[in-house]
């Protein structure tokens, strides 16, 4: 009959967790599951419960997680991996808009994330997008051109910097930048 369908794994309230702040990992399978297994990859950490409450985020808890469940003698496929990121590990970068934070509809603007440190990766996200509990998109450069701006691009932006050597240890978020489309 094949393996059972994979469960979902989410971090509440977010998979971006400031150091010392709490987060809950929740594995969700179908009703009547006999046993859950939630594990941190590349470690020996695991538990046989669906919910993991982390009362205070630490560097050592950042990383990739997944879960599965058992019904009878059958195990499910593993969930999609969840990347749990510790933020506030490094000083915040600065975020600016070129030529400026006010741009006409149809114009171009570039958001630049800058840091004093030698980080090689940056993450930019817009408040409310992407959906809650989902990692912001990662970009491997410090410039984020937005071509042919529309009203949908207006909003509050923040960026993070981090190193590819420790991809789950991020800086504090930059101060917010309000992009205004006129």
């Amino acid at each position: 009959s094949g393996p059972l369908p994979k469960p979902s794994l989410q971090a509440l309230p977010s998979s971006l967790v400031p150091l010392e702040k709490p987060v809950t990992l929740r594995c969700q399978g179908p009703p009547g599951v006999d046993l859950y297994r939630l594990e941190k990859l590349s470690s020996s950490r695991y538990q046989d419960q669906a919910v993991l409450f982390i009362p205070a985020m630490k560097r050592s808890l950042a990383g990739r997680y997944r879960c599965s469940y058992q019904n009878g003698s059958l195990w499910s496929l593993p969930s999609d991996q969840l990347e749990l990121v510790a933020t506030g590990v490094f000083a915040k970068p600065s975020l600016s808009a070129q030529p400026g934070p006010a741009v006409s509809s149809g114009g171009d603007v570039t958001l630049q994330c800058q840091t004093r440190y030698g980080f090689d990766q940056f993450a930019l996200y817009k408040e409310g997008d992407p959906a809650p509990y989902k990692n912001p998109e990662r970009w491997y450069r410090a410039s984020f051109p937005i071509i042919t701006v529309t009203a949908a691009h207006s909003g509050t932006y923040r960026c993070y910097s981090f190193s590819s050597r420790d991809p789950y240890l991020w800086s504090a978020p930059s101060d917010p930048l309000e992009l205004v489309v006129t």
């Epitope: 941190k40 470690s43 950490r45 982390i54 009362p55 050592s60 808890l61």
Partner: nanobody, 125 residues
Framework: QVQLQESGGGLVQPGGALRLSCAAS????????IGWFRQAPGKEREAVSC????????YYADSVKGRFTISRDNAKNTVYLQMNSLKPEDTAVYYC??????????????????WGQGTQVTVSS
């Protein structure tokens, strides 16, 4: 704020006894395994004893078996390490640690997320 605070260390003569306490604040210890670890000057940190949350099962390093006893009082959110028949080689800084993943015994010290600041135990005549 999640904190572990050790107390009870001090200077004691060989053959003496001490009782170390590890008090938790900011979260409840009920669900977590607790480990006691120690680090002597110039040496690596080593596991001394661990206790599970589920059934109270315990682990002891060979060097302390029969002399040390670990226990927990969930009502007081505290774990204890009773150390009897102390020897000079027990001299070290003693740390307690816990981790949100562990309800069963796990004495791999490098994988504990939460650590206390440590309490000094010196055994000397």
């Amino acid at each position: 704020q999640v904190q572990l605070q050790e107390s009870g260390g001090g200077l004691v003569q060989p053959g003496g006894a001490l009782r170390l306490s590890c008090a938790a604040s900011g979260f409840t210890l009920d669900y977590y395994a607790i480990g006691w670890f120690r680090q002597a000057p110039g040496k690596e940190r080593e596991a001394v004893s661990c206790i599970s949350s589920s059934d109270g099962s315990t682990y002891y390093a060979d060097s302390v078996k029969g002399r040390f006893t670990i226990s927990r009082d969930n009502a007081k959110n505290t774990v204890y390490l009773q150390m009897n028949s102390l020897k000079p080689e027990d001299t070290a800084v003693y740390y307690c640690a816990t981790d949100p993943f562990y309800s069963d015994i796990n004495c791999k010290s490098y994988e504990y997320a939460y650590w206390g600041q440590g309490t000094q135990v010196t055994v000397s005549s």
